[in-house]
Interface confidence: low
């Protein structure tokens, strides 16, 4: 009789993570009596995937019923597969022996390859907020994936970006892997509204790719325009001046009042309006009292947004000896002054 | 339909660097990689190294490792090789070729750069 | 790396003949393996990709079949244009290796 063969058809196997790998393998003789031990890898550092003759293999099943005795079908089902897993497997016929079995044949090995998704991109900004014409820097980072080509871009509001750099690692063959892009966005004042996207293709997402997104409205910080005018008298000897502040971004805002350079009064921005770009307007006024100035008033409009440095706007209400005489016609102008 | 037009023959002297460009056109230029291979007159096929038009990610095969810079502009949708420090050995023609990005088969080929390299 | 073995370095062979080229990978590469034909003077041209797949517009007598370590490329009742260099390209890892090629002569 011809000696015992293992035969292990398939040389590999491609199995998507999370499915069920069959490996097949036929023995083409009952002799020697033994059992089939299926190993991952050869050599002294094998492990041990099945041992039909002892021990508990949970995710593994026979695919035919191995206590019959004239069974030659040793493939196995290995379930839940991960990336982990990939490797080669070997079938191997041992001959009993006494005290122990002994290897007498292996199969030539079916290398199992997984394919794995990547997981979610996730896409992070700066830290801190930068204001227009600034340049940042947003990450975007999937792991998990096998096989390792990927295919990773960058959008602004749909546009493609090019200034990124991406790197796969390990560089090596893995069981998995990761990447890891940064890309380099110029922001402009029109950005609150605007997206950044990272866009990840793979051969397991199957012409769907993933998306990750980062709102530059958390990115962004558009510093406010100031205009200080003077409203129409309202009373004889009070004058209204109104402060604008205008195009900012976040709302976080305090404005303070100052006449010759004394707190008159500070507010906190509520009842804003919103621009169609996603910036607010906010707008003060102050009743200033002329009959109560002997000399010109000096009014500043001093504004702390989001935490920044303030910026000011003044305006000259010159206030004239005999203000009576002059009724509602008491002079103001706008110095056009605009201090930091 | 898809084509890649490959830059003009070059003549250059040991130690100087060569530059081809490769312009893609009729895909997505940002869909594919781009490889370079060459071929010594008589001899066999040898793959340089890749980029991938859509992240930039680069691999250089480690014979050609320091020499060797690869690059692509997506706006003109161009690919480029550069090899330095030429030695006679580089005569060679220099062929650009797309790359699909799962089993990294090369698909459409360029008609090929002629560098001879002579003092 | 990855060493790829092409055999036979040449063959003679007249129209209508079946032929087989074989190619053998230094370790196992799954179906990540892709053949050419290349012509003297011109760029080579993929005919079969990931072992078996054929390329749009290769005739059906090119065929591929292999996994793991052992490939072959055969071509059924071969052509007058048919004579030609033959390479096979392993795309499992880097550097990406050809095979040294076969040509294929006129009997």
């Known amino acids: 009789e011809e000696e015992l063969q293992v035969i292990q058809p398939d040389k590999s196997v491609l199995v998507a993570a999370g499915e069920t790998a069959t490996l097949r393998c036929t023995a083409t003789s009952l002799i020697p009596v033994g059992p089939i031990q299926w190993f991952r890898g050869a050599g002294p550092g094998r492990e041990l995937i099945y041992n039909q003759k002892e021990g508990h293999f949970p995710r593994v099943t026979t695919v035919s019923d191995l206590t019959k005795r004239n069974n030659m079908d040793f493939s196995i089902r290995i379930g839940n597969i991960t990336p982990a897993d990939a490797g080669t497997y070997y079938c191997v016929k041992f001959r009993k022996g006494s005290p122990d079995d002994v290897e007498f044949k292996s199969g030539a090995g079916t290398e199992l390859s997984v394919r794995a998704k990547p997981s979610a991109p996730v896409v992070s900004g700066p830290a801190a907020r930068a204001t227009p014409q600034h340049t940042v820097s947003f990450t975007c980072e999937s792991h998990g994936f096998s096989p390792r080509d990927i295919t990773l871009k960058w959008f602004k509001n749909g546009n493609e970006l090019s200034d990124f750099q991406t790197n796969v690692d390990p560089v090596g063959e893995s069981v998995s892997y990761s990447i890891h892009s940064t890309a380099k966005v110029v922001l402009t004042r029109e950005d609150v509204h605007s997206q950044v996207i990272c866009e990840v293709a793979h051969v397991t997402l199957q012409g769907d790719p993933l998306r990750g997104t980062a709102n530059l409205s958390e990115t962004i910080r558009v510093p406010p325009t100031l205009e200080v005018t003077q409203q129409p008298v309202r009373a004889e000897n009070q004058v209204n001046v109104t402060c604008q502040v205008r195009k900012f971004y976040p709302q976080r805002l305090q404005l303070t009042w100052l006449e010759n350079g004394n707190v008159s009064r500070t507010e906190t921005a509520s009842t804003v309006t919103e621009n169609k770009d996603g910036t607010y307007n906010w707008m003060s006024w102050l009743l200033v009292n002329v009959s109560a100035h002997r000399d010109d008033v000096k009014l500043t409009c001093q504004v702390e947004h989001d935490g920044q440095p303030a910026v000011s706007k003044s305006h000259d209400l010159k206030v004239s000896a005999h203000p009576k005489e002059q009724g509602s016609n008491t002079a103001a102008e706008n110095t056009g002054s605009n201090e930091r | 339909q898809v084509q890649l037009v490959q830059s003009g023959a070059e003549v250059k002297k040991p130690g100087a660097s060569v530059k081809v460009s490769c312009k893609a056109s009729?895909?997505?230029?940002?869909?594919?990689?781009m490889h370079w291979v060459r071929q010594v007159p008589g001899q066999g096929l040898e793959w340089m190294g890749w980029?991938?038009?859509?992240?930039?990610?680069?691999k250089y095969s480690q014979k050609f490792q320091g020499r060797v810079t690869i690059t692509r502009d997506t706006s003109a949708t161009t690919a480029y090789m550069e090899l330095s420090s030429l030695r006679s050995e580089d005569t060679a023609v220099y062929y650009c070729?797309?790359?699909?990005?799962?089993?990294?088969?090369?698909?459409?080929w360029g008609k090929g750069t002629t560098v001879t390299v002579s003092s | 790396d990855i060493q790829v073995t092409q055999s036979p370095s040449s063959l003679s062979a007249s129209v209508g003949d079946r032929v087989t080229i074989t190619c053998r990978a230094s370790?196992?590469?799954?179906?990540?393996l892709n053949w050419y034909q290349q012509k003297p003077g011109k760029a080579p041209k993929l005919l079969i990709h990931?072992?078996?797949s054929l390329q749009a517009g290769v005739p059906s007598r090119f065929s591929g079949s292999g996994s793991g370590t052992d490939f072959s490329l055969t071509i059924n009742s071969l052509q007058p244009e048919d004579f030609a260099t033959y390479y096979c390209?392993?795309?499992?890892?880097?550097?990406?290796?050809f095979g040294g090629g076969t040509k294929v002569e006129i009997k």
């Open positions: 070729a797309r790359g699909d990005y799962y089993y990294y088969y090369m698909d459409v």
């Open positions: 009729g895909y997505t230029f940002t869909s594919n990689a």
């Open positions: 980029i991938k038009a859509g992240n930039a990610e680069i």
């Open positions: 370790q196992s590469i799954s179906d990540f």
């Open positions: 990931a072992a078996s």
């Open positions: 390209q392993q795309s499992y890892s880097t550097p990406l290796s």
